[in-house]
Interface confidence: low
């Protein structure tokens, strides 16, 4: 019995179905086929869970969180024992193993391993200003999304006819910050933060209004 090499790793957007491949060759009939799918969750590597089981011609549910979401892609028994997981959740991220036994065919590699990563687009980021908006001050524009896998990067743009930040601005796309030094009236305007990762983007807006000093009455 020989389980075929798997693609190694699969990525899927949260909520979308995933197919975890596992196929094998065997010299024996599939009368005594026994297939166990296990997962080692990324969130709890010390606690492997059973996903689904095929034994004695019957299918059995695995861990409760997979109930109603998991099944074999084809009619069993078969040499293709791939499974699907519907409505993928963040907690489904982990390393999946298919363990295949088909007596009397013993020997060879009977385990296939596939990694599953559930990706999450950035949630609507939160934009805010830190620091005084008085002319001549330094301000920091902050942007962060609560959700996003892989971790989003953040790009700030000034929404004027250049779509560029002022020359006095420095940007950290990992932290989502822009520091604008010595702000002037020209720094005023609408700024947009675009949070992006492999599967999506989301934006927020921020209105920076630089405050000019009030003229003093002399008298």
């Amino acid at each position: 019995l020989e389980v075929s090499e798997s693609p190694g790793s699969i990525q899927v957007a949260r909520g979308q179905p995933a197919v975890l491949p596992c196929t094998f060759t065997t010299s024996a009939a599939l009368i005594n086929l026994n297939v166990i799918w296990m997962v080692t969750p990324l969130s709890n590597a010390n606690q492997p869970e059973q996903v689904i089981l095929y034994q004695g011609g019957q299918m059995f549910d695995g861990a409760p969180r997979f109930h109603g979401r998991v099944g074999f892609t084809g009619t069993m028994p078969a040499t293709n024992v791939s499974i699907f997981i519907n409505n993928t959740q963040l907690s489904d991220t982990g390393t999946y193993q298919c363990l295949v036994n088909n007596l009397p065919d013993i020997g060879g590699r009977n385990i296939g391993v596939t990694g599953l990563t559930v990706l999450v687009p950035p949630s609507a980021p939160h934009c805010q200003i830190q620091g005084s908006q008085d002319i001549g001050s330094d301000v920091i524009l902050l942007c962060s999304s609560e959700e996003g896998i892989p971790r989003p990067t953040y790009l700030w743009e000034k929404l004027d006819n250049t779509l560029k930040l002022p020359p006095t601005a420095t940007q950290d796309q990992v932290q989502g910050t822009v520091t604008i030094r010595n702000i002037s009236a020209l720094s005023s305007g609408l700024y947009q933060c675009v949070a992006s990762n492999a599967i999506g983007t989301s934006t927020c807006l921020l209105d920076l209004q630089v405050i000019s000093p009030q003229p003093r009455n002399i008298g």
């Epitope: 609507a124 743009e157 929404l159 779509l163 305007g189 609408l190 675009v194 989301s202 934006t203």
Partner: antibody
């Protein structure tokens, strides 16, 4: 004056791809976002995404993620929208629209629309 | 995604009538709300941006109001050229979602 001129109507088979172009004139192409909006026959407007012609950065509606690609060629002031794995429900008029007041709206400068028909 | 809900979906009115169309957002969008008019076979035309600002060249009989989640487009005295479909659209976040449209027909 500002003009957006789109490519002509297309008929495609399910599973194929279509690439619609939008040639801009009368303004600085790299200074304004370009949005793409579609409208199925008898239906409402559906925003697909935008491209920043300056940086090439894009922002796609989640519904089209993985199927749509927006690009631009700044040397000829043209934006492109390519939609792949076409299905019958992609039959629609596709519009490009320039970002307007503070880039927040799709302003009065729209292309004339390109009808894409997906039929076997 | 922010869901924009327009009401009514259609209405019949006469020339000279005052017409009001409402648009509700599923979450607060501040004043980032735009109104468009579309006639058959034509591209949409911007009427109002930022909830209440009249686009240049648009007749003053069109006005917009509201902030947060509830918005209104008002046509103070309906003219023959105003029979069309009207859409609201939020520009607070992506995707830039539209309402389903309100068709204004001749009574």
């Amino acid at each position: 004056q500002v003009q957006l001129v789109q490519s002509g109507a297309e008929v495609k088979k399910p599973g194929a791809s279509v690439k619609v172009s939008c040639k801009a004139s009368g303004y600085t192409f790299t200074g304004y976002y370009m949005h793409w909006v579609r409208q199925a026959p008898g239906q409402g407007l559906e925003w697909m995404g935008w491209i920043n012609p300056n940086s090439g950065g894009t922002n796609y509606a989640q519904k089209f993620q993985g199927r749509v690609t927006m690009t631009r060629n700044t040397s000829i002031s043209t934006a492109y929208m390519e939609l792949s794995s076409l299905r019958s429900e992609d039959t629609a008029v596709y519009y490009c629209a320039r970002g307007g007041q503070q880039q927040l709206v799709l302003d009065d400068y729209w292309g004339q629309g390109t009808l894409v028909t997906v039929s076997s | 995604d922010i869901v924009m809900t327009q009401s009514p979906s259609s209405l019949s009115a006469s020339v000279g009538d005052r017409v009001t169309i409402t648009c509700r957002a599923s979450q607060s969008i501040s004043s980032y709300l735009n109104w468009y008019q579309q006639k058959p076979g034509k591209a949409p035309k911007l009427l109002i941006y930022a909830a209440s600002s009249l686009q240049s060249g648009v007749p003053s009989r069109f006005s917009g109001s509201g902030s947060g989640t509830d918005f209104t487009l008002t046509i103070s005295s309906l003219q023959p050229e105003d029979f069309a479909t009207y859409y609201c659209q939020q520009s607070y976040s992506t995707p830039r979602t539209f309402g389903q449209g309100t068709k204004v027909e001749i009574k």
